[in-house]
Interface confidence: low
């Protein structure tokens, strides 16, 4: 999906008002210095591409993020403010349904959400310092 047509300011507002708080709740009890940020992005569309990938694509050791509150709100924000986004996500929804029903907060998931926090922060302050 090409995220260049999204309404970035509206998505930013959704992040600041709710998604950021849900990410903090998920990470509660974890030190902010525990994980190093290894994923970055250079522009807001690029950031949304990485955010989508980390939020909705199951990875080894963390298959359950898509059912978290921050993920559902992220999906809603993208669906509302990115034209045509919903139509591209039918396959992703099927994959989400196959994900584990129980919410298991593994260390790998915590690390992944820590990366997401960094990506969202970069979304609000785009532009890489260095390529």
């Amino acid at each position: 999906y090409d995220f260049t047509n999204c309404d970035f300011e509206k998505i930013k507002a959704a992040y600041l008002s709710t998604i950021s708080k849900d990410l903090i709740t998920y990470m509660s009890g974890t030190k902010s210095t525990e994980f190093n940020n290894t994923v970055s992005c250079s522009n807001r569309p690029h950031c949304l591409t990485e955010i989508q990938s980390l939020t909705f694509n199951p990875t080894a050791g963390c298959a359950s993020l898509a059912k978290e509150m921050f993920a559902m709100k992220t999906k809603a924000a993208l669906a509302i403010w990115c034209p045509g986004y919903s139509e591209t996500q039918i396959n992703a929804t099927q994959a989400m349904k196959k994900a584990r029903k129980s919410k298991v907060t593994t260390n790998k998931c915590l690390e992944q959400v820590s990366q997401l926090q960094g990506l969202w922060r970069r979304f609000n302050r785009p532009l890489l310092k260095q390529q």
Epitope: D2, T4, S42, N43, R44, P45, H46, R125, P126, L127, L128, K129, Q130, Q131
Partner: antibody, heavy 117, light 107 residues
């Protein structure tokens, strides 16, 4: 209304320094990056570097690393670009431009710097 | 560094003509390209960003498109105020680089 107002034209001798200012108004200064771009007479646009007004972190291209200093004064919403050890090839119009995603939606009017002995 | 090769360097056209300017990136920059218009003695003005998004207040006769690493700025019907120099610029990552410019002159 967003405005970037730059300081006036300068004439300098080789080896001297010049400091160009860019006063921003009409938006939150620390939200946008400030970039500096120069244009030699009859030539194209050359990106020099950028500064993040929120924390003053700068990124400069290699050729300017030793001679350019970019600073900001948050209290007056002003960005500065100082170029030292001036040479004749530094004669150019210097522009400040604000950006969020790397494209420039607002530019200063430009400051002409002439280096001549 | 990413190199931006812009062509042609100049062109002559008449009012009402369809004008096409191209820019080729030395590597994949996705849609991270902007187009500017510059008139003598003035600062550049943003026309298009993210390759195809028209900037606020820019007439609809201007349009941008992308195919791989090739980017195109099209003016569907050239107007007298469109005679100027046009620059492309990638905004994918540092260092930002501009194309060499295309001067659009009156035939």
């Amino acid at each position: 209304e967003v405005q970037l107002v730059q300081s006036g034209a300068e004439v300098k001798k080789p080896g001297a320094s010049v400091k160009v200012s860019c006063k921003a108004s009409g938006y939150t200064f620390t939200t946008y990056w400030m970039h500096w771009v120069r244009q030699a007479p009859g030539q194209g646009l050359e990106w020099m570097g950028m500064i993040d007004p929120s924390d003053s972190e700068t990124t400069l291209i290699q050729k300017f690393k030793d001679r350019v200093t970019m600073t900001v004064d948050k209290s007056t919403s002003t960005a500065y670009m100082e170029l030292s050890s001036l040479r004749s090839e530094d004669t150019a119009v210097y522009y400040c431009a604000r950006t969020l995603d790397g494209y420039y939606d607002y530019w200063g009017q430009g400051t002409t710097v002439t280096v001549s002995s | 560094d990413i190199q931006m090769t812009q062509s042609p360097s100049s062109l002559s056209a008449s009012v009402g003509d369809r004008v096409t300017i191209t820019c080729r990136a030395s590597e994949n920059i996705y849609s991270y390209l902007a187009w500017y218009q510059q008139k003598p003695g003035k600062a550049p003005k943003l026309l298009v960003y993210f390759a195809k998004t028209l900037a606020e207040g820019v007439p609809s006769r201007f349009s941008g498109s992308v195919s791989g690493t090739d980017f195109t700025l099209t003016i569907s019907s050239l107007q007298p105020e469109d005679f100027a120099t046009y620059y492309c610029q990638h905004h994918y990552g540092t260092p930002w680089t501009f194309g060499g410019g295309t001067k659009v002159e009156i035939k």
